[in-house]
């Protein structure tokens, strides 16, 4: 029962995580104009992986797609690739995990096959989560680098007469969504891998054999390791569960940045 719960919870957490990764990838607010010096601005810029947008005080928003592939920074291309790989792996992982769920009966599928599929989907979720976290982190690093570079050149004199303010960009909401979603997918994948261990069939066709040593009687039972690491009453594993649930709550309540004009 606990195995089914772990597997089911792992699936749900991964599903939420992958939905978050997709949402983050599609969002326009990967980087938003830094409003530190001017909290109320008449023109607000923000950028995504696929297009850049300008929101005016008038309420009009204009977005323009990046219609070039070769002209885009290599880092942006890398982030796009990482996010897409994460989505693809996650989607395949979800597909595999649906068939691997213990609560779903498909023909006469063996428990060992379900265990293998659970492990496969778990690994896919872990890699998917890591891809998303890596993609978002690369973008964040790119932003930090550009932020300090533009801060150094914040005011560039034009003929010593006029000042032009260079637009600085800071972390957008999509980065936080991406980090949280990647983390959830990762946690879901770990839970699937843990569930896999409990899914492998018990080798009950062997009887327990007693070996008598002088003064001691020790029984060795095949599959005993599995019994000792089962999910029913093992408090250590219960802590893992609680930790997992707590982490999920913490992650979901993580404050995401929203800039309003």
């Amino acid at each position: 029962m606990a195995v089914t719960a772990c597997q089911g919870l792992g699936f749900v957490v991964s599903l939420i995580g992958i939905a978050g990764i997709i949402a983050a990838t599609c969002m326009d607010q990967w980087s938003t104009q830094d409003l530190y010096n001017n909290p109320v601005t008449a023109v607000f810029n923000y950028q995504g992986l696929w297009r850049s947008c300008v929101r005016e005080s008038s309420g009009f928003t204009e977005c323009r797609g990046y219609f070039t592939l070769l002209g885009l920074p290599a880092m942006l291309q890398a982030v796009r690739a990482l996010m897409i790989v994460g989505i693809v792996l996650g989607a395949i992982g979800l597909l595999v995990s649906i068939f691997a769920l213990k609560c779903i009966r498909i023909g006469s599928m063996e428990d060992s096959a379900k265990a293998n599929m659970t492990l496969t989907s778990g690994i896919m979720f872990i890699v998917s989560g890591l891809c998303a976290i890596a993609g978002v982190s690369v973008f964040a690093n790119m932003l930090v680098t550009n932020f300090w570079m533009s801060t150094a050149n914040m005011y560039t004199g034009m003929g010593g007469m006029v000042q032009t303010v260079q637009t600085r960009y800071t972390f957008g909401a999509a980065l936080f969504v991406g980090w949280v979603a990647g983390g959830l997918t990762l946690i879901g994948g770990v839970m699937m891998c843990i569930a896999c261990r409990g899914l492998a069939p018990e080798e009950t066709n062997y009887k327990a054999v007693s070996y008598h040593a002088s003064g001691h009687s020790v029984a060795y039972k095949p599959g005993g390791f599995k019994a000792s690491t089962g999910f029913g009453s093992n408090t250590k594993n219960k802590k893992i569960y609680d930790g997992g649930a707590r982490t999920e709550d913490e992650v979901q309540s993580y404050p995401s940045k929203h800039d309003y004009v």
């Epitope: 008449a42 850049s52 005080s57 008038s58 309420g59 006029v162």
Partner: antibody, heavy 118, light 113 residues
């Protein structure tokens, strides 16, 4: 057609407050920000502030140091501009203007003359 | 605050001649996000509210005669009336629409010579 109709002329004493209204019609009221601009006699234009009728968010010109308050009444599609602690230099024509693409003001009210005199 | 400086203060041009008004801002009005200049031109006739002519420095509002054109980028902008008509006698204002507080130029009075 788009129309912005402002309230009538006002004569106030220094230190008093004035509340000018601007009734919008002919378009989706909550879809466009409303701005207030004033023009002293024989002088140029001066932006006072704006309000987003959808969210109710406001931006003000710091020059007025909290003397200006913009409010809305969605039910009547009306924007109000209140200017407190009036002084003689506040004598001007006050305009409401709808904000358009490029943050430009495409439609203006006919103007309300506010005279501050002791 | 961005300071808008218009020149000349007044301008007398013969009917059918070209009128050119300049506007200079203390900071660039070019937005890097969409490469548009947030500068607007207005026409104000005596006893009337201002009328929008041009926004985004060069985009004419629908219904505005094509003799009015705007140009410039960054900090230097120009409003040109290619062939002055009697009804163009007015005061012309430029406005910064890029940064709060939104600021206006002092105005340029156009008269017929």
């Amino acid at each position: 057609q788009v129309q912005l109709v402002q309230s009538g002329a006002e004569v106030k004493k220094p230190g008093a407050s004035v509340k000018v209204s601007c009734k919008a019609s002919g378009y989706s009221f909550t879809g466009y920000n409303m701005n207030w601009v004033r023009q002293a006699p024989g002088q140029g234009l001066e932006w006072m502030g704006n309000i987003d009728p959808y969210y109710g968010g406001t931006s003000y010109n710091q020059k007025f140091k909290g003397r200006v308050t913009l409010t809305i009444d969605k039910s009547t599609s009306t924007v109000y501009m209140e200017l407190s602690s009036l002084r003689s230099e506040d004598t001007a024509v006050y305009y409401c203007a709808r904000m358009y693409h490029g943050n430009a003001f495409d439609y203006w009210g006919q103007g309300t003359t506010v005279t501050v005199s002791s | 605050d961005i300071v808008m400086t218009q020149s000349p203060d007044s301008l007398a041009v013969s009917l059918g001649e070209r009128a050119t008004i300049n506007c200079k801002s203390s900071q660039s009005l070019l937005n890097s996000g969409n490469l548009k200049n947030y500068l607007t031109w207005y026409q104000q006739k005596p006893g009337q509210p201002p009328k929008l002519l041009i926004y985004w420095a060069s985009t004419r509002k629908s219904g505005v005669p094509d003799r009015f054109s705007g140009s410039g980028s960054g900090t230097d902008f120009t409003l040109t009336i290619s062939s002055l008509q009697a009804e163009d006698v007015a005061v012309y204002y430029c406005q910064n629409d890029y940064s709060y507080p939104l600021t206006f130029g002092g105005g340029t009075k156009v008269e017929i010579k």
